[in-house]
Structure formats: structure tokens, C-alpha cells
Interface confidence: low
Amino acid sequence: MSKGEELFTGVVPILVELDGDVNGHKFSVSGEGEGDATYGKLTLKFICTTGKLPVPWPTLVTTFSYGVQCFSRYPDHMKQHDFFKSAMPEGYVQERTIFFKDDGNYKTRAEVKFEGDTLVNRIELKGIDFKEDGNILGHKLEYNYNSHNVYIMADKQKNGIKVNFKIRHNIEDGSVQLADHYQQNTPIGDGPVLLPDNHYLSTQSALSKDPNEKRDHMVLLEFVTAAGITHGMDELYK
């Protein structure tokens, strides 16, 4: 067990703070909840503290919860591939470029680390080149979320990882908006981290609303499990 992994044996409170600017539309989001890495479970509620969110909530799910991948459940035989927990408590910097097909892009930078007993994800998001009447600024996405695989590989030069995946957002007309994600994570501290073999995270997310909440918000339940490396994976490469 890595030193960081010991911090995730029980339920951990989570705080998410985001400051965003998409095509000049500025906004802030605050999220609170908890994570349980034993089950790979996240429960979070996000509130737009600046009024109405200028982009659809589903476009921010990867920035919020895929940001705290330290809560992913890594099976026993894969624990030596869990970069995310090994970087704790000092944490990691997570940077992404998200390309929305035939539309604009988000660039995000986050610091994910423990502040006391709370896991905090502080994010800056900048979005550019979006069409005002497109799927994103035109709010044409359905309020739901698909399952995805998130592919992870070591980046030895930067003592971190590279991650890429493609998100499928459902559009109200029945079509799909694709969003390419290019991600890199680097540790904040100087301590040793686990550099993984190639594997993936299997994600399942459910979006809902709090009937008692008047502000623009999103409630998220998510389960994330690492996979893709078997007990005998060495045999595959002989």
C-alpha cells in the first residue's frame, strides 16, 4: 500500500471549487460531497454560485469528478498502478484540453490535494471558440451521462501520467456531441509516486436534481473502477 493510499480507507469529504470563463461568460461553481475509494463511489452536489450556468452541466462532469480520480476503486492486483492515491496528500496538478467536435474547446488546470481531512479540487477553466447557437452555449445537451473508459499511461519524463478518452454527450435531437479529452497529471510533492502500466478506468455516472434546491445545480453519483490489467498480464507481452 502506498502512503497516500492509506488516506482513502474510509469515506473522505470532497470540496470542489471552479472558476470558469467560456467565450467571455464568467461563472463559478462550488461542489461538496464525499468519496469512498473502497467502492469507487462519489456523491457530489454542485451549485453555480454566480446564477445560471452558461454551459450545460454534463460538459463539466469530467472537470469535476473525473478530476478526483483518486477515488477510483483499484482492485488488489492493480493497486501498484494507482498513481492518483500515491500522489497524496500533497496531490497532483491535472491539466486538460477538451475538444468539442465541430465546436470550441475547454482548457482546464486543477490542483487536487488534501487540505486537512478534505480532498479539494480547485479548478480554472477557460473555454474559447464556441458557437453561440451550438450544442454547448445553445444548451442542446440532454441532462444525462454515458459510461466511458478512461485510458491511462505513464509519463516517465514528467513523473506522472497521460490520460485520454472521448466523451459522448447525448443531444436533444438524438445525436451525439463528442468531446476529446487530453489530460496530464503531475505530482505536486517530491515524494515517490506509482507510475502505472497502461490500463483504464471504467466510469458510470448518474445526474439528478435536488428538488429542494432553488439555485442552478447538479447532483452527481459516480462509480469508477480500474481495469485492463489481469493477474497474468505479463503473459500477453511475452
Epitope: Y151, M153, N164, H199, Y200
Partner: nanobody, 120 residues
């Protein structure tokens, strides 16, 4: 691609696809099929960086996709073949690791295809 041909229902075939090293490495390699008058369908794919596989529901339990890193080759082992498996089968290289299971638009390089015919 190679390995296509004609076979009786219940029989087996093994398709092979060799690609360049740069295309093969840490990419998604997919097998597609297209029957006359039908859309091209992704039947199976594999992420070569980690042996991660995807299968269409129609072939789960019958088809197996595998890889040989030393030969830059992916295989499609097709067992318990049915007449409805008759189609032209294509090997394709994805745009990246995310392409597996994403359909033909997310694949960049395509083979010429090999015909598989299953008779009853």
C-alpha cells in the same frame, strides 16, 4: 487483412491484420463488417497499449480479438459462425486509444477487406 473465406454454419475462421509499428502502438485496432445494403458495424476492437477489448453484443462469446505486439498484428478469431455473420470484414486503425467501441468515424486507416461467407 487475410483469413477470410467460405465456411459452414458452426465453423470457425481466423482473420489477421498487420499494420505499421507507429500505427499499431498504443492505439485502438478494430474489426468491422459490412453486409450488402447494411451499415458498417464495429464487431470487435482492442487497445494495443493494454489488451483492453470491446465486442458488439451480436458477437460476444463467439468472437475473440487478440494482439501480437512483436508482429504488429491483431487477430479476430470467429467461432460458431452463423449465416448472418456473412459480410466483408475490414481491419481499421483508430484515431487514438479512445476509438474502441466508438464506430467507424473514429477510425483513421482502413484495410481493403476480406470476404467471409457462412452457409447453412
Amino acid at each position: 487483412e487475410s483469413g477470410g473465406g467460405s465456411v459452414q454454419a458452426g465453423g470457425s475462421l481466423r482473420l489477421s491484420c498487420v499494420v505499421s509499428r507507429s500505427t499499431y502502438t498504443s492505439n485502438c485496432m478494430g474489426w468491422f463488417r459490412q453486409a450488402p445494403g447494411k451499415e458498417r458495424e464495429e464487431v470487435a476492437s482492442i487497445y494495443t497499449g493494454g489488451g483492453i477489448t470491446y465486442y458488439a453484443d451480436s458477437v460476444k462469446g463467439r468472437f475473440t480479438v487478440s494482439q501480437d505486439n512483436a508482429k504488429n498484428t491483431v487477430y479476430l478469431q470467429m467461432n460458431s459462425l452463423k449465416p448472418e455473420d456473412t459480410a466483408m470484414y475490414y481491419c481499421a486503425a483508430g484515431r487514438g486509444s479512445w476509438s474502441c467501441g466508438m464506430g467507424p468515424d473514429e477510425y483513421k486507416y482502413w484495410g481493403q477487406g476480406t470476404q467471409v461467407t457462412v452457409s447453412s
